[in-house]
Amino acid sequence: AGVFELQIHSFGPGPGPGAPRSPCSARGPCRLFFRVCLKPGLSEEAAESPCALGAALSARGPVYTEQPEAPAPDLPLPNGLLQVPFRDAWPGTFSLIIETWREELGDQIGGPAWSLLARVTRRRRLAAGGPWARDIQRAGAWELRFSYRARCELLAVGTACTRLCRPRSAPSRCGPGLRPCAPLEDECEAPPVCRAGCSLEHGFCEQPGECRCLEGWTGPLCTVPASTSSCLGLRGPSSATTGCLVPGPGPCDGNPCANGGSCSETPGSFECTCPRGFYGLRCEVSGVTCADGPCFNGGLCVGGADPDSAYICHCPPGFQGSNCEKRVDRCSLQPCRNGGLCLDLGHALRCRCRAGFAGPRCEHNLDDCAGRACANGGTCVEGGGAHRCSCALGFGGRDCRERADPCAARPCAHGGRCYAHFSGLVCACAPGYMGSRCEFPVHPDGVSALPAAPPGLRPGDPQRYL
């Protein structure tokens, strides 16, 4: 287990002519946010393929408003790292996809609108535990500067985070074939020490000194891709006589999962689902209690403190498995309707809805009056692909649920005093003025310069505005 971390340093117009002045459209201010997606391997994957290693979304950056005549700056960025937790081994080779999204803050129906501004893809090799790697990438007319690293967490160590170590606080149980982890004292690593040079990524061992290869790899140290052999389509150990791959066990044949774990094949590898009380790549770590912190990815451990009592991990949203070690690709369910964009935030799944739609899954059409009442006697009016509420007197807002103060706009002219009334407002005019808004001056001889006051109303009397 571990976490991939991405730090965005800057995002702005690239050098050269034709660089954009602003990320915002002509509709007004906007702000940026970033999405990072990790996919295993170095192959060029389809953009829409799932982020099998995980994904994360940044917070929104500060609001940006273009300054006329000012040079185009680096744009204000969200604070903090983007973190993508990963379970089990760090693959070492991966595809990194960084998307820059624009949130427009103009007066869109249904709230802000989102659009993809730039997307960069890097296929990289990276060992866990190494220093920050820096990069500069161009996406169209934009330039993105960023750093990234992978680091192990919890009980994992090594360049692939595959070596599991007992925490320092736990009693030392270094048995035969187990040695202290190099960087830390009083900790011992399980699984056993493999043959020197055995690939951390593509090999494993169940007995000290051996090196068994995962599917797709061969050689004494599991460093040779099986596809380089002249015998394609076969899997298993390399034949000493022919150099060809001979039919051999699949990744789950012989069940590499210890302690009653069940094995399932994954592309190029396998995955163990461990029974309660066991965890690790091959369910090899046992005698575990909540004190050992066996629940990954923020899972809540419930169970006794003695080694004989089983524990239960209550997993947070997005994770499953007996130790919350399996990430659920929830966006693959395509829960967002009406063209909404699915974003897995880790703790929550969020649909970014197209303008005119709202709701947890963009299921609600804001553009139509059907089933959408306007409050307080207002009536719903459709038109131009949108709806609006025509509110009764004394009410305002999009749904007519805000009490409108008819006097707020100071409608009474020439010092007239405004009084809110159940059907609107009343202006009490200052001496010398008359009219529903005190807009007409009264001549000294008592005759108004504009239309006369209605019968029964003297100049200076309150005028009710309907």
Partner: antibody, heavy 118, light 112 residues
Framework: EVQLQQSGAELVRPGALVKLSCKAS????????IHWVKQRPELGLEWIGW????????IYDPKFQDKASITADTSSNTAYLHLSSLTSEGTAVYYC???????????WGQGTLVTVSA | DIVMSQSPSSLAVSVGEKVTMRCKSS????????????LAWYQQKPGQSPKLLIY???TRESGVPDRFTGSGSGTDFTLTISSVKAEDLAVYFC????????FGGGTKLEIK
Amino acid sequence: EVQLQQSGAELVRPGALVKLSCKASGFNFKDYYIHWVKQRPELGLEWIGWIDPENGNAIYDPKFQDKASITADTSSNTAYLHLSSLTSEGTAVYYCASEDAYYPFAYWGQGTLVTVSA
Amino acid sequence: DIVMSQSPSSLAVSVGEKVTMRCKSSQSLLYSSNQKNYLAWYQQKPGQSPKLLIYWASTRESGVPDRFTGSGSGTDFTLTISSVKAEDLAVYFCQQYYSYRTFGGGTKLEIK
């Protein structure tokens, strides 16, 4: 730990207004929609409406459109239900619940009992 | 509005028995684009708030015992408890989240 903590019981007069609160903790308030649900004895659960705290958009069941108003304060991670012109039919337990795009009402508040009585 | 109907309104069973309760919606809850049913089941024990049991019609919530199973598609759905335990005494509600939100009237499970 994810929690939705609701305000205490209310005894109100007919025709009055009441404001109930639902304070969220243990998760990012802006990433979840907050719903309000009414429960009367033997009448099951009635959905009132939801609010998206990120932008303040609220949607209501038309039946509650004139009676209820939902607001949210992101600075305090609190959602509010405003009930107006209460009658005896407003006597009920009111629950808040959170929802994201994957899970429906995964977390619920403990409920607030509102009693409308002269 | 989508109307949700539950049956039976109540039932009494002995511990260890299998229980089936049904929920019917007035229109289909199956979204063709993802072939998912926007239906959930909740359990409400006496004096407590409702608790999510099943979502997407058949996905069991984390921590819910595997004796609870949701099934069905379109307009007809079922919640099955394979072997009832005393702690399952509760009212069970179905809910659609396809459009707005509506709940069924509930099925009250009593233990003989």
